[in-house]
C-alpha cells in the first residue's frame, strides 16, 4: 500500500511518502510518519528558540524536544524546560542565554512521546544562525561641510563579530545606496548635498568572523540628516519595509 | 523518487584510503540533506558523515579527523573519502538522502532518511 503525508512546505518533494524505519534498509518494518523540522535560531546571543510546523502533523500532537551538545557521542540529553505552544500544542522550545554553546555542536532529538520510535536527531552549528537584535542609537555628525558620518550600536555582541549593512537614499533617489561595512560600526559618506534630504539605516549579521550566519537583524529606526523642505512626491520616496 | 547507488567500497589494508561516491537520480540533491551510514554484522546501523544542503558537515566521533565528505550538486553525487582505515571501519556503508525545508538541517538519526542506496563493503584487513 502507498500513503502520502501531507507536510506544509514549499518543497514538494517533502510531501513525504511514509517513512520507513528499520534497522537496515532492506529489512521494512512498520511505516512511521516523519516529525518535522526543527528550525532554530539564537536571537542576540540572549535566548534561543527552536520551533517546529506543529500544524503539519495530522493529529495534535504534543511533541518532545530534548537537546545536548556534542562534548561525545553519548553525552546525555535534556528536555526542553520552556516550551512554545501553538494552539495549546508544543511548537517549540525557548533555551535561556545559559544553555547556550555557540561554538559546541548542538545536539536536539525530537519525538512523540506516544510512539517512542518516532524521533528525529538534527545537528546545528548554533554560531550560524544567530540573528542579532536591530542596530540602535543612530547618530549623524558632520565631520565637514560635505562630509557625514554615521555611527550606531549593537547590544551584547561584540563588534567584530558583526557585519552591517548600510541603506541610504536622498528624497531625490527612487532606490537605497547600500554597501558592507564590516566590524566598525561607523559609515562617512564624503559627499552630501544639503539641499537634499537623507534617509540612513543598518542591519547586521554575525558573519564573518565569530560565525557564518546569512540571517540579518532587523532595519535600525531610520535616522534623517539635511534640508526639511517638502519633497515633490511623497509617495514615491515612501520608505519601504 | 531518488535513486541512490553507492560504489567505491573494497578490501583495503590498515592505514589505507578508499573513497566513496554516492550517485543520485531521478531528483537534484541540492536541497537534501544527506548522510553516510555504516552497518557492522550484528551491530546497529550508525551514522558516519551527515551533511545539511546549507554545508554544515558533522562526524561521528569515531571517524573525526580521518573521513571527509563532499558533495558535487552538479554532478548529483555525494562522496565519502575515508584515510587511515582500520580494521573497526569494516561495515556496510550505505549512502542516505532526505528533502529538507531548511538549509541547516542535518540528520543523523537514520529513520529521518527517506532514501538510500544498497550499500557498498568496505573490509579493513589488518
Known amino acids: 500500500w502507498s500513503s502520502k503525508v501531507l507536510m506544509s512546505s514549499a518543497n514538494e518533494d517533502i510531501k513525504a511518502d511514509l517513512i520507513l524505519t528499520s534497522t537496515a534498509p532492506e529489512h521494512l518494518s512498520a511505516p512511521t510518519l516523519p516529525l518535522p523540522e526543527v528550525q532554530c535560531f539564537v536571537f542576540n546571543i540572549e535566548y534561543m528558540n527552536c520551533t517546529w510546523n506543529s500544524s503539519s502533523e495530522p493529529q495534535a500532537t504534543n511533541l518532545t524536544l530534548h537537546y545536548r551538545y556534542k562534548v561525545s557521542d553519548n553525552n546525555t540529553f535534556q528536555e526542553c524546560s520552556h516550551y512554545l505552544f501553538s494552539k495549546e500544542i508544543t511548537s517549540g522550545c525557548q533555551i535561556q542565554k545559559e544553555d547556550i554553546q555557540l561554538y559546541q555542536t548542538f545536539v536536539v532529538q525530537l519525538q512523540d512521546p506516544q510512539k517512542p520510535q518516532r524521533r528525529a536527531v538534527q545537528k546545528l552549528n548554533l554560531q550560524n544562525l544567530v540573528i542579532p537584535r536591530a542596530p540602535e542609537n543612530l547618530t549623524l555628525s558632520n565631520l565637514s561641510e560635505s562630509q557625514l558620518e554615521l555611527r550606531w550600536k549593537s547590544r551584547h555582541i561584540k563588534e567584530r563579530c558583526l557585519q552591517y549593512l548600510v541603506q541610504y537614499r536622498s528624497n531625490r533617489d527612487r532606490s537605497w545606496t547600500e554597501l558592507i561595512v564590516n566590524h566598525e560600526p561607523r559609515f562617512s559618506l564624503p559627499s552630501v548635498d544639503e539641499l537634499k534630504r537623507y534617509t540612513f539605516r543598518v542591519r547586521s549579521r554575525y558573519n564573518p568572523i565569530c560565525g557564518s550566519s546569512q540571517q540579518w537583524s532587523k532595519w535600525s529606526q531610520p535616522v534623517h540628516w539635511g534640508s526639511h523642505t517638502v519633497e515633490e512626491n511623497p509617495s514615491l520616496f515612501a520608505l519601504e519595509a | 523518487q531518488v535513486q541512490l547507488v553507492e560504489s567505491g567500497g573494497g578490501l583495503v589494508q590498515a592505514g589505507g584510503s578508499l573513497r566513496l561516491s554516492c550517485a543520485a537520480s531521478?531528483?537534484?540533491?541540492?536541497?537534501?540533506?544527506m548522510g553516510w551510514f555504516r552497518q557492522a554484522p550484528g551491530k546497529e546501523r550508525e551514522y558516519v558523515a551527515i551533511?545539511?544542503?546549507?554545508?554544515?558537515?558533522f562526524y561521528a566521533d569515531s571517524v573525526e579527523g580521518r573521513f571527509t565528505f563532499s558533495r558535487d550538486n552538479a554532478k548529483n553525487e555525494v562522496y565519502l573519502q575515508m584515510n587511515s582505515l582500520q580494521p573497526e571501519d569494516t561495515a556496510v556503508y550505505y549512502c542516505?538522502?532526505?528533502?529538507?525545508?531548511?538549509?541547516?538541517?542535518?540528520?543523523?538519526?537514520?529513520?529521518?532518511?527517506?532514501?538510500w542506496g544498497q550499500g557498498t563493503q568496505v573490509t579493513v584487513s589488518s
Open positions: 531521478g531528483r537534484t540533491l541540492s536541497r537534501y540533506a
Open positions: 551533511d545539511s544542503w546549507g554545508g554544515d558537515t
Open positions: 542516505a538522502g532526505a528533502p529538507t525545508s531548511f538549509a541547516t538541517t542535518a540528520y543523523s538519526s537514520s529513520n529521518s532518511y527517506r532514501y
